[in-house]
């Protein structure tokens, strides 16, 4: 084994790269000192360390990991950051498109609807967003509330345009009568099925990527331990102390070091694996009734058949909806 | 005798957004993000030997330092006799994680279990049955999925509608409704946001 | 602009029946009801009926359901009222008007008027 | 049938003055009450939809309030182009019935 070259007669190499820790260099013995008040660099022999230039290095050292374990994690960090962003936003844009499209479908198909109509898809739309940004909102109750809305201006609207205003006053009547008869056939219970198994899918995967985002913020942020401060002052910094400036730590030293001071860190693994994974399985079933921008994209369209169901059937409920909801009109038809 | 309007205003022609050369859909863009962070499922047990391929470490050199003492790098000193000698080994005795650590893996547990009862069994995109009561005649069938989009030749099948490179500007606005012989043109500047 | 044009005067004979109509422009036609309005000379106004084109709904004033019949043709957006057995009681002029749907039924454009007069 | 009762059947008042019509419908109709002026040898035009809603191009002197059973319609500084007849009517519920009227003179 090599014999260890002498420590620095005057401490003078040390002096100068503890300066760059510390201005002012009052900790820095001017000569090797015997360094028997040390607990982390204990000296074989005389050394150029003091106990508060070691409780600096422990100081540095503890930063020198924070900050490489930050950038560690940042390209995995920004990766899933930027993706969750972009991802949120194009579910707005697909929302925003959705409500356009049934707007539009409405304004060109339903004029005399109009009003009402774009108010309750309004609301139905910002149901869904709210839905998705994890609101707590039952899917089964928008698409119910959105069909109870319009089943009243439809009735009023569309299948007897010219009723009296009293006809107005039988709204509530009109909404349950809505269920009771199954007017808009089984097209609400078709929506309500793929749009809450869509929002759902939709909804989870972007909690995860939110939660990934949390995981690399934790792992990034940790605080170690003043155990793990002293191994890495060991390995860093306390070969300064004899004088050896341009040394580096062995490699093999240097693993075992980081799994002791990452051993809880790496415990994650397992579950980060996992996550990985199985945000693969949920993206690779994303398609067709599982994809809200396939689902959500198509809705005026399934809506426009709901109302030509309704209109289809419309003699038959418009007779059936008299007695039901008998309002004192005296409907006189020709 | 009911009438019908025939024009049916969103059709093919009107929705149809001219043909891009790279159609980047929200699934494209999805199945990209999870192939790469497939590059990154070692990434924490990977983690110590990221840190020490990061630091300061002797690679060429004759001599390293051990914790204790300078030793040459491929004797068994280089990892062994200075931590045995200082470490006490106290220091390196299993702690269990820290609190934040144990919260995060149970939310990690959580959202996996979240996940996995989401993902779709194979080859079973779709419930059949959704309802044992027959449509009346005009409904979709048992394919719930059939009925996306349908409405004969006046409507259109939407199929990956939303394209990033052409379509997510595509915004109507209620006020300014296409009319039939309008095509939906796509403006430049909300694209930026989605290019890499 | 919103107009509803209405035919000219007419002359009848007791127990007759007359046509008139009302021709519109300035507005989607299958999206509005017409009402029909009669006004005796130095009376006031009385509510005939309302048709509205798209789906052909018709609403008749009970008192006026075996006098008058509406109909209306979408090709050239003309709603018509015929008038049958004619009596004195049937002269007046008659107004055709645009009404909204339920809850927005307040008549906002009104044609010129028909003057129909019955005498033997 | 909903009857609705306007009073009084003429009105006479000098240019500026602030001048209120009444309409008392039978039962209550909520707000379902429109108001038309007609000039002599005229067409009824549309001044106030749903008790008080306004009509674009109708001069803002013309405003409208009630609901139920009691409407009225006020011009709040008459001009002699105001010289007609005006009337009330309900689409409450079948038959839309119209009152009588009531005539604007002016001293």
């Known amino acids: 084994q090599p014999p260890p070259p002498p420590p620095d007669a005057t401490c003078h190499q040390v002096r100068s790269f503890f300066q760059r820790l510390q201005p002012g260099l009052k900790w820095v013995p001017e000569t090797p000192v015997p360094g028997s008040d040390l607990q982390v660099c204990l000296p074989k022999g005389p050394t150029c360390c003091s106990r508060k230039m070691e409780e600096k290095y422990q100081l540095t050292a503890r930063l020198n990991m924070e900050q490489l374990l930050q950038s560690a994690s940042m390209e995995l960090k920004f990766l899933i950051i930027q993706n969750a962003a972009v991802f949120q936003e194009a579910f707005e844009i697909v929302v925003r498109h959705a409500k356009n499209y049934t707007n539009a479908m409405f304004k060109n198909n339903y004029p005399s609807l109009t009003p009402q109509a774009f108010e309750f898809v309004g609301e139905f739309f910002t149901d869904v967003s709210l839905y998705i940004l994890g609101s707590d909102i039952n899917v089964d109750d928008m698409v119910n509330e959105l069909f109870d809305s319009l089943f009243p201006v439809i009735y009023t609207q569309l299948m007897n345009p010219g009723l009296p205003d009293s006809a107005l006053d039988i709204n509530e009547c009109l909404r349950g009568a809505r269920r009771d008869l199954k007017v808009f056939g089984n097209f609400p219970k078709l929506i309500m099925t793929q749009v809450s198994k869509s929002l759902q899918v939709t909804r989870i995967f972007l909690q995860a990527l939110n939660l990934g985002i949390e995981v690399i913020n934790t792992t990034d942020h940790l605080k170690f331990s003043k155990d793990c401060g002293r191994m890495l002052t060991r390995m860093w910094y306390c070969s300064y102390c004899q004088g050896l400036m341009m040394v580096k730590p062995c490699g093999g030293y240097c693993n075992v070091v980081m799994q002791g001071c990452m051993a809880g860190v790496v415990e994650i693994d397992k579950y980060w694996r996992e996550y990985i994974l199985s945000l693969e399985e949920l993206v690779n079933g994303m398609y067709r009734i599982y994809d809200m921008e396939n689902v959500l994209l198509g809705l005026f369209s399934t809506i426009h058949d709901s109302i030509q169901y309704v209109q289809k059937n419309a003699g038959k409920l418009t007779t059936t909806i008299g007695k039901l909801c008998a309002h004192s009109q005296q409907r006189q038809y020709r | 005798s009911a009438y019908y309007p025939e024009d049916l205003f969103i059709d093919k022609k009107v929705l149809k957004v001219a043909h891009v050369e790279h159609e980047e859909t929200l699934s494209s863009r999805r199945r990209e993000l999870i192939q790469k962070l497939k590059s990154f499922i070692s990434f924490y047990s990977a983690l110590p030997g990221y840190i020490c391929s990061h630091s300061p470490v002797a690679e060429n050199d004759t001599l390293c330092w051990n914790g204790q003492e300078l030793v040459e790098r491929y004797s068994q000193k280089a990892a062994r006799n200075g931590m045995k000698n200082q470490f006490n080994l106290h220091e390196l005795k299993m702690k269990g994680p820290e609190p934040v650590v144990s919260q995060i893996i149970d939310k990690l547990k959580h959202i996996n279990q979240l996940l996995r009862t989401m993902s779709v069994p194979k080859g079973r995109v779709l419930d059949k049955n959704l309802d044992e009561e027959g449509f009346e005649s005009g409904d979709c069938g048992d394919d719930e999925d059939e009925c996306i989009g349908g409405s004969g030749d006046g409507m259109m099948k939407v199929k990956n509608q939303l394209r990033f490179l052409a379509e997510l500007a595509y915004d109507l606005d209620v006020d300014d409704v296409p009319g039939n012989n309008q095509q939906a043109t796509p403006k430049d500047n909300e694209i930026s946001t989605f290019h890499n | 602009q919103v107009q509803l044009h209405q035919s000219g005067a007419e002359m009848a004979k007791p127990g007759a029946s007359v046509n008139l109509s009302c021709k519109t422009s300035?507005?989607?036609?299958?999206?509005?009801?017409i009402s029909w309005v009669k006004q005796r000379t130095r009376q006031g106004l009385e509510w005939i009926g309302d048709?509205?084109?798209?789906?052909?709904?018709?609403y008749y004033n009970e008192k006026f359901k075996d006098k008058a019949t509406l109909t209306a043709d979408r090709s050239s957006s003309t709603a018509y009222m015929e008038l049958r057995s004619m009596t004195s009681e049937d002269s007046a002029v008659y107004f055709c008007a645009r009404r909204g749907t339920t809850g927005r039924g307040a008549l906002d454009y009104w044609g010129q008027g028909t003057s129909l007069t019955v005498s033997s | 049938d909903i009857l609705l009762t306007q009073s009084p059947a003429i009105l006479s008042v000098s240019p500026g003055e602030r001048v209120s019509f009444s309409c008392r419908a039978s039962?209550?109709?909520?707000?379902?009450i429109h108001w038309y002026q007609q000039r002599t040898n005229g067409s009824p035009r549309l001044l106030i939809k749903y008790a008080f809603e306004s009509i674009s191009g109708i001069p803002s002197r013309f405003g409208g309030s009630g609901s139920r059973t009691d409407f009225t319609l006020t011009i709040n500084s008459v001009e002699s182009e105001d010289i007609a007849d005006y009337y009330c009517q309900q689409t409450y519920n079948w038959p839309y019935t119209f009152g009588g009227g009531t005539k604007l003179e002016i001293k």
């Open positions: 048709i509205y084109p798209r789906h052909i709904n018709i």
């Open positions: 300035g507005f989607t036609f299958t999206d509005y009801g």
């Open positions: 039962q209550s109709i909520g707000t379902s």
